[in-house]
Interface confidence: medium
């Protein structure tokens, strides 16, 4: 089941999928001055069996007449998103994508590929958020969003991340105490029942607080 919408937008943040669930589609888009070859694939599709997942179809671009270049853009490996893709300023540490069952790794670039990639995500896809350069992450919880099916409709969970400029205040608005550890899954799907007072956040900008049981470092 394809997700209806784009993942949520967080000010001053971009997101990235580390691996793509089977069923994900990637549009075959070409850079300006190029087009898909005749009878070429419209998209690549992540498919697989129990032991291996891979992208079906190949995207191929060929030179087009200058006056016929109505261009639609789509992402590069470092810049993905569904329908709207933005660049990760400092790429997350790569994960061993190939070994995650039911997922495809990032497809290799093709010749004359467009500068952005447009992905169509499926239910169960996770994307990971990161603040753009010059902004610092303040976490209330997971900096990730998951596409879920609820009552027959798809929705993305809200990533619990705020990106603040270096000079701005470090605390979340209206929050007396920073939380340390992300509590449960996004949108209160708690599997680890821990109260906010059990934790304190330890970042370079967090103030010293009273003793608590655990301390989290966000690097």
């Amino acid at each position: 089941e394809l997700c209806d919408d784009d993942p949520p937008e967080i000010p001053h943040a971009t997101f990235k999928a580390m691996a793509y669930k089977e069923g994900t589609m990637l549009n075959c888009e070409c850079k300006r001055g190029f087009r898909r070859i005749k009878s070429g694939s419209l998209y690549m599709l992540c498919t697989g069996n129990s032991s291996h997942s891979s992208w079906d179809n190949q995207c191929q671009c060929t030179s087009s007449a200058t006056r016929n270049t109505t261009k639609q853009v789509t992402p590069q490996p470092e810049e993905q998103k569904e329908r709207k893709t933005t660049e990760m300023q400092s790429p997350m540490q790569p994960v061993d994508q190939a070994s995650l069952p039911g997922h495809c790794r990032e497809p290799p670039p093709w010749e004359n590929e467009a500068t952005e990639r447009i992905y169509h995500f499926v239910v169960g896809q996770m994307v990971y958020y990161q603040c753009v350069q010059g902004y610092r992450a303040l976490h209330r919880g997971p900096a990730e969003s998951v596409c879920k099916m609820t009552h027959g409709k798809t929705r993305w969970t809200q990533p619990q991340l705020i990106c603040t400029g270096e000079m701005e205040t470090s605390q979340f608005p209206g929050e007396e105490k920073p939380q340390a550890s992300p509590e449960g899954r996004p949108e209160s799907e708690t599997s680890c029942l821990v109260t906010t007072t059990d934790f304190q956040i330890q970042t370079e900008m967090a103030a010293t607080m009273e003793t608590s049981i655990f301390t989290t470092e966000y690097q």
């Epitope: 580390m18 540490q93 994960v95 061993d96 992300p182 899954r185 655990f214 989290t216 690097q219």
Partner: nanobody, 127 residues
Framework: EVQLVESGGRLVQSGGSLRLSCAAS????????MGWFRRAPGKEREFVAA????????LYANSVKGRFAISRDNGRNMVYLQMNSLKPEDTAVYYC????????????????????WGQGTQVTVSS
């Protein structure tokens, strides 16, 4: 078969240091958060430290904060626990564990959230 194997535990003097290692095999190790727990004689299993799959986040029990440091090497499928300024109350069997949700940024300090465990390594701190 997923396996975690701890090593590095031994008898050490109070104030000394130890580095525990945990070798993982049989799983997409680099996509799982990892943790260290310990069980002292006659006590419940206790959370010590955890590290996220992408090494962005680390979580420590306050009893070890500033003395212990968790790290991982995804290329070698290893997790480490550097233990400094050891105290007699750190005496326990130390267990390495893997979180049961891949690619999660949800840091957990509850043993039930970890589904794969090593057999443990004994750390004894003498006064």
């Amino acid at each position: 078969e997923v396996q975690l194997v701890e090593s590095g535990g031994r008898l050490v003097q109070s104030g000394g240091s130890l580095r525990l290692s945990c070798a993982a095999s049989g799983r997409a190790f680099s996509t799982h958060n990892m943790g260290w727990f310990r069980r002292a004689p006659g006590k419940e299993r206790e959370f010590v430290a955890a590290i996220s799959w992408n090494v962005d986040n680390k979580l420590y029990a306050n009893s070890v904060k500033g003395r212990f440091a968790i790290s991982r090497d995804n290329g070698r499928n290893m997790v480490y626990l550097q233990m400094n300024s050891l105290k007699p109350e750190d005496t326990a069997v130390y267990y390495c564990a893997a979180d049961n949700i891949p690619l999660s940024s949800d840091m957990r300090a509850t043993a039930t959230e970890y589904d794969v465990w090593g057999q443990g390594t004994q750390v004894t701190v003498s006064s």
